[in-house]
Each structure stands twice: as structure tokens, then as C-alpha cells.
Interface confidence: medium
Amino acid sequence: LKGQEFAPSHQQVYAPLRADGDKPRAHLTVVRQTPTQHFKNQFPALHWEHELGLAFTKNRMNYTNKFLLIPESGDYFIYSQVTFRGMTSECSEIRQAGRPNKPDSITVVITKVTDSYPEPTQLLMGTKSVCEVGSNWFQPIYLGAMFSLQEGDKLMVNVSDISLVDYTKEDKTFFGAFLL
């Protein structure tokens, strides 16, 4: 056969290049949250829309019960933006009747949960002061970075005050990840 004269002297197998469209990916968008009681050092997890509007999950990347489930090991880019909004934040008004009903800062954490580890791992954290902003304020916090994840890892987004999350538009508050 004509092709044989060009065959290399040793066999070499090349894995086919994987199309980007086959890689696990997800983009989740904000929905209205239902706050529940917690201790102040416990940052509640947000829940998300995963199929309507701009939201999607593809290629075995699944969303369930506030978690994005990682279907295969690899390097992933993980990102989230949470927009907070409030009515007032003068520092003198923050502690009403001795109660910290309004925070003096807002925090977003992207957390990884691995079943074999007893404690969740904080992957990314962002904090902003809300003392110096105006009476009706909006503050987005964006986080994004690459991480090596294992199959079965779970990702979630935690916030310091779920009652301040702006759930009005899907382009204001979102969460996603994709395999690089």
C-alpha cells in the first residue's frame, strides 16, 4: 500500500483533540433566596437557576441543591459575581438597638466540598466595606480563578448576608465553571 512507505518505524497513538464544546461547563443565574436563621459566622449558600434564561449546565456538569458537581478531574476556571444592595449604610445606623441588623461589610466565598475531607475549602473570597457608600447602594463582588478539581468535588457560593443579595436580574448575580 502506498501509505506504508510513509509509516514511522514505531507505532505512535495520538489522542484526538477534544472539542471545547464537549467539555463540562455551567453558568448559573440568580433566583430569589429564602433566608433562614444561622449563626453569624456561618455564611449561607446561595441557590441558583440552572436552565432558564441565560443559565445552563452542559456535558455532565450538574447542579443540585446549591452545588455544582464536577464530573471529571481537571483544571477549571471558576467564577462568580454577587451584587448586593441595601437601603442605608451610614455606620452610625448600622447597629440599631445594639443589634448588628445591617452589616458593615459584605463577603462572597466560593467553596469547594470534597466528600473525603471533613471541612469545606475556601477557594476564593471577596469582601467590601459598605460603610462609605451612599444611602441606596449597590455593590458587586466578582471572583474568578483557575483551580485543579477532582471528579466528585462540589462547588457552592456563600455570602455573609443572604438578605442583601440582588436577585432582580440574571446578569447581576451569577456563578459558573468550565473545564479548561
Epitope: P35, Q37, H38, F39, N41, N101, D161, S163
Partner: antibody
């Protein structure tokens, strides 16, 4: 007046189960988080569990996780603690206590306590 | 877990004395701390909330102070009915934790 009355305590063998109840009166039970706190004989106070005002959030101290279950029945204004696989170290007076629930987001400790019910785990 | 160090573990005092009990926490808890009084065979009773606010119905001789990691309960003039065990409680962090208690006895 605001009142909490615990019941259901008693003597039980290790490995057995017991269910404690706490009947609330004098306030809108469904608006408050509720705690269980215990006190071993001659010892200090130890927090055991909490349930949020809406029943959606339940938290436990490590030593009872997987064995104890806190629940509430707002229609009966009653708090429960189901205690399974009891151990000698669970011997204590068990108090139910109301969380002040100043906002719906945070727990604030305990402002009203019941008189307690005694649980003795012994063979 | 946040560790609570309450001191002293016991003290002897006379009626009319000024008594101070201290509670230290292993982490900053802002003012998320309460003080409780317990008499033998009775349920605890809350005296102070938010570190310094007096619970309704509690005599004004009781006061609380502090923020962050160091807190104090003061009884300005000890009365016969004040002989009891006192506990601090932090509710900032899960799990909430009590101090070991301070027993106030008659000298």
C-alpha cells in the same frame, strides 16, 4: 406569661431511644428559633441543638450528630428532641430554650428557658 | 469552635461587695455574648445580652461590658439572692459555647 415545659425524660439503657418534648405557651411559637441545652450532673451548660423558626435549619453539637434529631410542630407549639443510640455521657438535665430571634437571619442565644427534664442513661 | 475562658471558677464574697467575672473568647465575637445566672436545681436565667444590655426585669446592679474577645459581668452590690453560678455564652459562631461557670459563694 411566656412558658416552656419539658417532658419525656427518664431512665433508659445505653443504646435505647427517648423523645423529649417541650410545650410552649404565651408567645407565637412559630416565630422563634428554639434550642436544646443540657447539663450533666455537677457540670456546666452544653448547647445541644437548634432549629430555626421555620424549621428549615437544624444544627447539632458534634457529639450528638447522627443520633439526635430536633424537630418542631408549630400547630402544637411543641419542640422535640429525638434521642437515639443513647450513651452514658448523654446523662443530663435537658432544657429547651427560646431564641430571641430579633431578626429572621441570626440566632441570638436563649432568653427563655424551661425547667428541664432529667435523662439518665444507665444499664 | 470558639473557646470560652471564664474566671474565676469560684469566688467568695459578702453581701454588699462588688463582684467582677470575666469571660475571654478565642476569637473576636463582637458583642454577641450573654450572661446567665443559675441557682441550684433551677433553669438558667438571662441577665445580660449583647454584652452590655440589661435583660428586662433584671436589677440594675448587674451590668455587662466588653467587646471583641474580653467581657465582664459586674454585680455592683452583691445581694443575698445573687449567690449562684454565672455563665457566659457566645452566640456569634456555630456551635454556641458557654463558659465553664463561676460559682459565687457566701464568704
Amino acid at each position: 406569661q411566656v412558658q416552656l415545659v419539658e417532658s419525656g425524660g427518664g431512665v433508659v439503657q445505653p443504646g435505647r431511644s427517648l423523645r423529649l418534648s417541650c410545650a410552649a405557651s404565651g408567645f407565637t411559637f412559630s416565630s422563634y428559633g428554639m434550642h436544646w441545652v443540657r447539663q450533666a450532673p455537677g457540670k456546666g451548660l452544653e448547647w445541644v441543638a437548634v432549629i430555626s423558626y421555620d424549621g428549615n435549619n437544624k444544627l447539632y453539637t458534634d457529639s450528638v450528630k447522627g443520633r439526635f434529631t430536633i424537630s418542631r410542630d408549630d400547630s402544637k407549639s411543641t419542640l422535640y428532641l429525638q434521642m437515639n443510640s443513647l450513651r452514658a455521657e448523654d446523662t443530663a438535665v435537658y432544657y429547651c430554650a427560646r431564641d430571641p430571634t430579633v431578626t429572621l437571619y441570626y440566632y441570638y442565644g436563649m432568653d427563655v428557658w424551661g425547667q428541664g427534664t432529667t435523662v439518665t442513661v444507665s444499664s | 469552635d470558639i473557646q470560652m475562658t471564664q474566671s474565676p471558677s469560684s469566688l467568695s464574697a459578702s453581701v454588699g461587695d462588688r463582684v467582677t467575672i470575666t469571660c475571654r473568647t478565642s476569637q473576636d465575637i463582637r458583642d454577641d455574648l450573654g450572661w446567665y445566672q443559675q441557682k441550684p436545681g433551677k433553669a438558667p436565667k438571662r441577665l445580660i445580652y449583647d454584652a452590655s444590655s440589661l435583660q428586662s426585669g433584671v436589677p440594675s446592679r448587674f451590668s455587662g461590658s466588653g467587646s471583641g474577645t474580653e467581657f465582664t459581668l459586674t454585680i455592683s452590690s452583691l445581694q443575698p439572692e445573687d449567690f449562684a453560678t454565672y455563665y457566659c455564652l457566645q452566640h456569634n459562631s456555630y456551635p454556641p459555647t458557654f463558659g465553664q461557670g463561676t460559682k459565687v459563694e457566701i464568704k
